[in-house]
Interface confidence: medium
């Protein structure tokens, strides 16, 4: 049998059974998550679960820009440094940039400082680009 690769929505890119949408619009973290959800298919702000996934995403985004941070689906809802993925994925792979995670910074972004391969925490009300993900 021929195994067909599932198709993503127009403009979204496919990698390892997932579709990703890079939104070059300014949204705070919660509005970004709501916009991801509005696309259905169980879409959320993206979870990044391996270095391979991180590298693919980073390469794609670098084709557009190299200076703006991007919201991902990692947050600290209890504000106790207990980070979790909004889509329910296991928080095993970690790629923090090593910066201080104190203060009122309870949402995670892909940092442009290391070509989007590492994450930083930031204030959730900041308006930034964002990355959505769903499984087709």
């Amino acid at each position: 049998d021929i195994i067909m690769r599932p198709s993503c929505a127009p403009g979204w890119f496919y990698h390892k059974s997932n579709c990703y949408g890079y939104f070059r619009k300014l949204r705070n973290w919660s509005d970004a998550e709501l916009e991801c959800q509005s696309y259905g298919n169980g879409a959320h702000l993206a979870s990044i679960l391996s270095l391979k996934e991180a590298s693919t995403i980073a390469e794609y985004i670098s084709g557009y820009q190299r200076s703006q941070p991007i919201w991902i689906g990692l947050h600290d809802p209890q504000k106790r440094q207990q980070w979790q993925w909004i889509d329910g994925a296991m928080y095993l792979y970690r790629s923090w940039s090593g910066k201080s995670m104190g203060g009122n910074k309870h949402c995670a972004e892909m940092s442009s400082n290391n070509n989007f391969l590492t994450w930083s925490s930031n204030e959730c009300n900041k308006r930034q680009h964002f990355l959505c993900k769903y499984r087709p």
Partner: antibody
């Protein structure tokens, strides 16, 4: 009052050069990215080039890359477009435009909308 | 990619008109869309930015929206007035460039 005033247009032969200027007033010029947009007679708008507030980043449409150079002198509140190797298809009204900035967010130059436009200057390339 | 707009649209005063702008490839939702009005003999004016935001001074008769299903943006003008006549351009951006639609000529009958 926020104002942009272009000058330097005129008639030039194919292969010739021209430098357009855009004098800005009424705002802190160095804080804003700027663009040149052109409009051929009876045609639509075509973005030509953009420059960041500091002048450190510049961007060009493929149609003018290597022939046109955008620059700015923040001490004189003036934007420039140096146009070399001009062609008949460069004939157009050239507008300078300011890029709007919201909330002090340091954002990519060309992503901002253009909220203030000059009155335009006509460049005619013909022999 | 390209932004495609209808060449011309006509409507009577007081009516509502919707101008469309369709993106040929890539998602219309990924990048902000702006709309510019250009009255005859004048410079362009920004009437909608960031998909649906109105600059101060632009009447609330002007509204913008995005439809990811049709991959298009729309500019709706209600209570059409004679001074609304002119060309309307949608605009978005791509990797290091601004992209304009071809423009729609709006005639108020």
């Amino acid at each position: 009052e926020v104002q942009l005033l272009e000058s330097g247009g005129g008639l030039v032969q194919p292969g010739g050069s021209l430098r357009l200027s855009c004098a800005a007033s009424g705002f802190t010029f160095s804080s804003y990215a700027m663009s040149w947009v052109r409009q051929a007679p009876g045609k639509g708008l075509e973005w030509v080039s953009a420059i960041s507030g500091s002048g450190g980043s510049t961007y060009y449409a493929d149609s003018v890359k290597g022939r046109f150079t955008i620059s700015r002198d923040n001490s004189k509140n003036t934007l420039y477009l140096q146009m070399n190797s001009l062609r008949a298809e460069d004939t157009a009204v050239y507008y300078c435009a300011r890029h709007y900035q919201s909330g002090g967010y340091v954002y990519i130059t060309f992503y901002y909308p253009m909220d203030v436009w000059g009155q335009g200057t006509l460049v005619t390339v013909s022999s | 990619f390209m932004l495609t707009q209808p060449h011309s649209v006509s409507e009577s005063p007081g009516k509502t008109v919707t101008l469309s702008c369709t993106r040929s490839s890539g998602s219309i939702s990924f990048d902000y869309v702006q709309w510019y009005q250009q009255r005859p003999g004048s410079s362009p004016i920004l009437v909608i930015f960031e998909d649906d935001q109105r600059p101060s001074g632009v009447p609330d008769r002007f509204s913008g929206s995005i439809d990811s299903t049709s991959n298009s943006a729309s500019l709706t003008i209600s209570g059409l007035q004679s001074e609304d006549e002119g060309d309307y351009y949608c605009q978005t951006y791509d990797d290091n460039r601004q992209v304009f639609g071809g423009g729609t000529k709006l005639t108020v009958l």
